[in-house]
């Protein structure tokens, strides 16, 4: 068919330290040489459908699916994945081919499937189908550990169903708060699956293999701590085990602990108690509430009560599917060159997220900190005052989240100039975006005060480099100014910067920086 465009489909694999801008991007990163995916016309299909060769991707790899369209005129497009339409921004390469890209950041199971690209050109409409799957999904997994009670013993077993077999360790800490950080001297690690000492302040179990390390904390209510303003909240998915530990210390043994769910005592078999005397002869009691596989009706307020301590509760919420709750609206910030500033994202998520911060194709490690109100926060301060677009990307087993930030650094303009036989152009990246003036230097105006208004064309935010806006001004050359020196000046609230250009006949142009 003569009307059909020439289409090329390619796969770009990005190196591990590459990262990208989330779901879709019109500016994919340059990386390894693109792999041709064929893109043959699919026979016996209604409408024009091209099918790319199947794509197999490693878990956590980042790729770009790219389509190059050799067709005259403009094109418009739409990506569809799992019945959701995704933004699509075509642009044109140096050979004037339409380029459409889909960036998949850190491949997960949820991103595998069929990606459909609908393209509309002036001549025709057509569809391109990509099938993306994860390579060797079953070979490597790392699952978050969970707890089980050891048969006929007051002990917990830590289990992580991972491949290759993970190393399991208990991470124990007996002090409060900050001093329970991973590398603190207060932290004791035990590389074993079974734990008998269940009276500690902070108990976590971690599993690690080639894919990394995942940890689960034993959710604890400590009745000796003052009741928190915010009720602690625990999320679980249907089918997961529930474990909550209630702990209390008293001067003697004359107290007991009880668990209730929504004011009804827990059934026998859903709790067990342990007690011991501490070094100073006080009595420590712990009472575990557990459900081996939770259902929706296990949701509610779990209250631990004691005759000698104030009662405390936790809200347990059972969900069908994991989630990430946060506001995804983009945020713009404007700071001074030496101002201290951090981006931050506040979110509530279950299971715990994995996240990255990305700027200018580079990925940065992402730390998250739990807040008292059940939310977590991730901050990024390592921007080195570079203006541009910063991306926070988070995902867990069931959900993905991307948030864009723009950082503008207030500074006076710096001007670069270039010229051709017919025009002179000046560029500046100062912020706020500068305004322009052109002046002619002549015998009548040796200080270059004679303003030029004819033939000036200003373009604001002409090109966007990782979110950094560049402003330009072009002067079309006329006989009246040929052979003269002209001065372009960019100014904003922080200052002015100028560049002087000699408009002589074609040839090399001297520029004089003039601040």
């Amino acid at each position: 068919n003569q009307d059909l465009p020439v289409i090329k489909c390619v796969l770009i694999n990005h190196k591990n330290n590459d990262s990208s801008v989330g779901k879709s991007s019109s500016y994919p990163m340059v990386s390894e040489s693109p792999e041709d995916l064929g893109c043959a016309l699919r026979p016996q299909s209604s409408g024009t459908v091209y099918e790319a060769a199947a794509v197999e991707v490693d878990v956590s790899a980042s790729i770009t699916l790219q389509v190059l369209v050799d067709a005259p005129g403009n094109i418009s497009c739409l990506w569809v994945f799992k019945h959701s339409s995704l933004n699509c921004q075509p642009h044109f390469d140096l050979q004037n081919r339409g380029v459409v890209s889909m960036v998949i950041l850190k491949m997960t199971e949820t991103q595998a499937g069929e990606y459909l690209l609908f393209i509309q050109s002036e001549a025709t409409n057509y569809t391109i189908l990509f099938t993306v799957s994860i390579r060797n999904t079953l070979l490597y997994t790392l699952r978050r550990p969970y707890f089980r009670k050891m048969e006929n013993q007051d002990a917990l077993v830590c289990i992580s169903e991972s491949v290759p077999e993970p190393i399991v360790e208990w991470v124990l800490c007996d002090s409060q708060g900050e001093s329970c950080k991973e590398e603190s001297p207060a932290v004791v690690k035990k590389e074993e699956k079974v734990l008998h000492e269940l009276f500690g302040t902070d108990i976590r179990c971690c599993a690690r293999n080639e894919l990394g390390r995942e940890c689960t904390r034993l959710f604890t209510i400590d009745l000796n701590q003052t009741p928190q303003t915010t009720l602690p909240q625990l999320f679980l998915k249907v089918g997961e085990p529930l474990w909550i530990r209630c702990k209390a210390v008293h001067v003697n043994h004359g107290f007991g602990l009880t668990w209730e769910l929504e004011n009804k005592a827990l059934e026998e078999g859903n709790y067990f108690e342990m007690s011991t005397y501490s070094t100073n002869r006080t009595m420590i009691r712990i009472l575990f509430a557990f459900v081996s596989s939770v259902a929706r009706n296990d949701t509610g307020y779990y209250t631990c009560s004691s005759s000698k301590h104030p009662s405390q509760s936790a809200l347990v919420t059972i969900v069908e599917k994991g989630f990430i709750n946060a506001t995804n609206s983009s945020e713009d910030y404007e700071i001074d060159q030496y101002e201290e500033f951090c981006f931050s994202v506040r979110f509530k998520a279950y299971p715990q997220i994995r996240c990255t911060w990305t700027f200018s194709r580079k990925s940065f490690p992402c730390e998250q900190k739990g807040l008292d109100n059940g939310y977590s926060i991730s901050k990024f301060c390592n921007h080195k005052h570079q203006p541009g677009e910063y991306i926070f990307h988070a995902e867990n087993d069931d959900a993905q989240f991307t948030k864009m930030f723009t950082l503008n650094i207030r500074r006076k303009p710096q001007v670069l100039a270039e010229a051709s036989a017919s025009q002179a152009s000046c560029f500046s990246d100062g912020y706020p975006l500068p305004s322009w003036t052109w002046k002619k230097c002549s015998d009548k105006s040796p200080n270059c005060t004679e303003e030029i208004t004819e033939g000036v064309w200003n373009r604001k935010a002409n090109r966007k480099v990782f979110g950094q806006w560049v402003s330009s001004s072009t002067l079309n050359m006329s006989e009246a100014i040929k052979g003269f020196l002209v001065k372009c000046c960019a100014y904003n609230s922080l200052g002015t910067s100028c560049e002087t250009i000699l408009l002589n006949s074609p040839g090399p142009f001297p520029f004089i920086q003039d601040n």
């Epitope: 004011n263 209250t303 104030p310």
Partner: nanobody, 111 residues
Amino acid sequence: QVQLQESGGGLVQAGGSLRLSCAASGVTFSINYIDWYRQAPGKQREWVAQITRDSNSFYADSVKGRFAISRDNAKNTVYLQMNSLKPEDTAVYYCRVLSYWGQGTQVTVSS
């Protein structure tokens, strides 16, 4: 819809007394424990006292011996009797049942 309403706050001189009430609707009071909290200007909200379902009471160290918490299940109301008030007791006082909070009542103790 659970609603809690505090009342009884006001201006009192140091050494004086006040009795705060917390009335509840939409929740069966008798089966829950109730906490009183307070928040002084520019400070974090802090726990003051608790009364359990079986009328056991617990107090923060700062109010022990001066404040007394009680409940009237028939009226769905909890009380906080505050004696020997000090200027540092000045705060907005809130009652709480599980995740539910009242709007608060202002207590000001002048010296």
